[in-house]
């Protein structure tokens, strides 16, 4: 009777677009059939996907966040079979160019400008922004209550990913029209 | 969670056929080992056909040459055509799925169907 398997990786937490992966389904055994699934399917037919030593052996190339999914192995011979646990692929991705909210650029003076900064990042980046070029606080929002037409002028949020060892960022133009004016958005 | 469902039995004379089919729902895996047992009044389950990953089948020996198990992976249906039924024969018959151990074990499947009587007369 064939026992439980289990797999085992080289790389547990691989990079997007830069590492591959070997998924390896223990233990090898005589006269056994290995086979894989991916979120309970078959596999997909993929150039980036290489079963080798006979096919006790998944190999995926330039991995992408799309493969953050749950593989299985599965062995099996003329009287028993058995299927491992699920291990799901860790994929380090990111950052992602960030998104500013809200979209609008023209506020009236003494509104709260509140802006939040987000980037698909694994894991989550950490957040800074600057205005005008200078440094800010190093948080995924910003806020300045009762904002005056000093406050015009760019504001860059900066995103980094320390596991993948990536940044990226965003500048948004705010400009702040005093009161009795009528910008093209008010907040 | 897997859902089984049985359909195909009934009442049949001996030398007749019936073709039973098991249908599989739920957190399912392609191409999954999906085996048919039956079990008489006053009787354990016995296994009675296996179909595995690669589609191999087993039987027990009483019903080879009788008896065949066949999966239609779109529908993710398995089947069990059974011909020249014997008096024998009558049981109710379950499917099963989610196996981790002998194909012919019971206790190695997880998830099972509430089963489909089949009678044979003489």
């Known amino acids: 009777e064939l026992p439980k398997p289990s797999i085992s990786s080289n790389n547990s937490k691989p990079v997007e677009d830069k590492d591959a992966v070997a998924f390896t389904c223990e233990p090898e055994a005589q006269n056994t059939t290995y086979l894989w699934w991916v979120n309970g399917q078959s596999l997909p037919v993929s150039p980036r996907l290489q079963l080798s030593n006979g096919n006790r052996t998944l190999t995926l190339f330039n991995v992408t966040r799309n493969d953050a999914r749950a593989y299985v192995c599965g062995i099996q011979n003329s009287v028993s079979a058995n299927r491992s646990d699920p291990v799901t692929l860790d994929v380090l991705y990111g950052p992602d160019t960030p998104i500013i909210s809200p979209p609008d650029s023209s506020y009236l003076s003494g509104a709260n400008l509140n802006l939040s900064c987000h980037s698909a990042s694994n894991p989550s980046p950490q957040y800074s922004w600057r205005i005008n070029g200078i440094p800010q606080q190093h948080t995924q929002v910003l806020f300045i209550a009762k904002i005056t037409p000093n406050n015009n002028g760019t504001y860059a949020c900066f995103v980094s990913n320390l596991a993948t060892g990536r940044n990226n960022s965003i500048v948004k133009s705010i400009t702040v029209s005093a009161s009795g004016t009528s910008p093209g958005l008010s907040a | 969670e897997v859902q089984l469902v049985e359909s195909g039995g009934g009442l049949v004379q001996a030398g007749g056929s019936l073709r039973l089919s098991c249908a599989a729902s739920g957190r399912t895996f392609s191409r999954d080992v999906m085996g048919w047992f039956r079990q008489a009044p006053g009787k354990e389950r016995e296994f009675v056909a296996v179909i595995n990953w690669t589609d191999s089948t087993y039987y027990l020996d009483s019903v080879k040459g009788r008896f065949t198990i066949s999966r239609e992976n779109a529908e993710n249906t398995v089947y069990l055509q059974m011909n020249s039924l014997k008096p024998e024969d009558t049981a109710i018959y379950y499917c099963?799925?989610?196996?981790?151990?002998?194909?012919?074990?019971?206790?190695?499947?997880?998830?099972w169907g509430q089963g489909t009587q089949v009678t044979v007369s003489s």
């Open positions: 099963a799925t989610g196996i981790g151990g002998l194909y012919r074990r019971p206790s190695a499947y997880k998830y």
